[in-house]
Amino acid sequence: MRTEAQVPALQPPEPGLEGAMGHRTLVLPWVLLTLCVTAGTPEVWVQVRMEATELSSFTIRCGFLGSGSISLVTVSWGGPNGAGGTTLAVLHPERGIRQWAPARQARWETQSSISLILEGSGASSPCANTTFCCKFASFPEGSWEACGSLPPSSDPGLSAPPTPAPILRADLAGILGVSGVLLFGCVYLLHLLRRHKHRPAPRLQPSRTSPQAPRARAWAPSQASQAALHVPYATINTSCRPATLDTAHPHGGPSWWASLPTHAAHRPQGPAAWASTPIPARGSFVSVENGLYAQAGERPPHTGPGLTLFPDPRGPRAMEGPLGVR
């Protein structure tokens, strides 16, 4: 066993910064600031749009705003996945895409965002107040889920603005409690900074970190407001539940999907990332491969401390479909 990628730790401010403000007052804002800066990320956004052309057709777009790389995306409706929600699509970078009616086409838009078009007719069609949820699994940080629905007043063809994490369900114990503490901390930090601003500036001993003080003031409000968005999503709409799809006829596909405990499988769209036309599966297995770097001979961005990953703007190389479907 080995750990391939290490997440760079935030460096704490250096010790020995006791000035006229005193140790407690100076260190606390830095601790809180560190917490506030990290509390707001990562985040998931969900955008639900009703198509003007087909009034009962929906497009759901979801994205992950975070530094981690996505290794599984699950889209569900009627509530969060695993909490009464019904899976519509599962997207895996290597093994491909699987979807169930009324999902018409799921696809990767970028390496960290997906879109899903829903069919609009029949008993299983969505209605305007249906809740759609997207869950992004990022390794090894955990999974984050956000839910969204069309605003009651929205006109066809208009989309609800992206909802940044109405539900942030990190699979870490006590995340909500911690978020509450962090939110309080961020507010307290703001209060401290405001109070500090109205006070005559104390003379600090020379310090390498003092130039960062203005940045602290600039960061805090945005992060605090971001943290405020991370509230538990309580009102799951169940007035418009999808019909059971047990009568659907499976059409083969990759065997790894065979026993998913959702409804009977419709024909899988082969991983159609960055492609509008779905690629049908051939034979009993779908051959999929992780599409990594766009140019042959291009060196990969190795994961490691302090590394920023820059995805190729064109996404994975299109070999028989971007993920290698044959």
């Epitope: 996505i70 290794s71 090894p140 051959s287 990969p300």
Partner: antibody, heavy 120, light 106 residues
């Protein structure tokens, strides 16, 4: 820290069954495939199959379809592989492995292996 | 299923020597991955997606190839490189490994 902890060595008799375990820690167990690999002395690596615990989805190498059965217990973050009707051909070290695939990279995490000896 | 044939099965090389291990697939694959295994230890991912070095792998290693023909190369053999190397395809189920190449130091 991501870790896969496998159960201890097993000495079995021909015809019996054995259930190997692989306990995962350090990541969201339900969202990642656990693969099983066989290594016999003097032979190469063989891919047995895989399971996605959160979806109870399995995929087997046809060669091992009647030999291996994968299960998962999400409450204990443990994946199991049961090997049935054991013969001397099943004497091997069995590894559970997590290979994480994203658009950017592969990462691998291996259990320490469980040695199974089938002998009368 | 796709059969991967590695050659040579066993080879020895002197320190500083260039080493090339090949892996031939029975049908075309998109990428090839390579694993290193030393006696008594679990295998380790060594090269992924044909040419990308896994974390911690020395830069003297490289991988190349396409279609049905792939190779792993060590520009200058070192004692710590003595191990068994396996190629693996993940383009078509079931995933398969090559038979392995045991690399020894002279």
């Amino acid at each position: 820290q991501v870790q896969l902890q496998q159960s201890g060595a097993e000495l079995m008799t021909p015809g019996s069954s054995v259930k190997l375990s692989c306990k995962a820690t350090g990541y969201t167990f339900t969202d990642y495939w656990i693969e099983w690999v066989k290594k016999r002395p003097g032979h190469g690596l063989e891919w047995i199959g895989e399971i996605l615990p959160g979806y109870i989805s399995t995929n087997y190498n046809e060669k091992f379809k009647d030999k291996a059965t994968f299960t998962a217990d999400t409450s204990s973050n443990t994946t199991y592989m049961q090997l049935s009707s054991l013969t001397s051909e099943d004497s091997a070290v069995y590894y559970c492995v997590l290979i994480v695939t994203t658009y950017y990279y592969f990462m691998d995490y291996w259990g320490q292996g469980t040695s199974v000896t089938v002998s009368s | 299923q796709i059969v991967l044939t590695q050659s040579p099965a066993i080879m020895s090389a002197s320190p500083g020597e260039k080493v090339t291990i090949t892996c031939s697939a029975s049908s075309s694959v998109t990428y090839m991955h390579w694993f290193q295994q030393k006696p008594g230890t679990s295998p380790k991912l060594w090269i992924y997606s044909t040419s990308n070095l896994a974390s911690g792998v020395p830069v003297r290693f490289s991988g190349s190839g396409s279609g049905t023909s792939y190779s792993l190369t060590i520009s200058r053999m070192e004692a710590e490189d003595a191990a068994t190397y396996y190629c693996q395809q993940r383009s078509s189920y079931p995933w398969t490994f090559g038979g392995g190449t045991k690399l020894e130091i002279k």
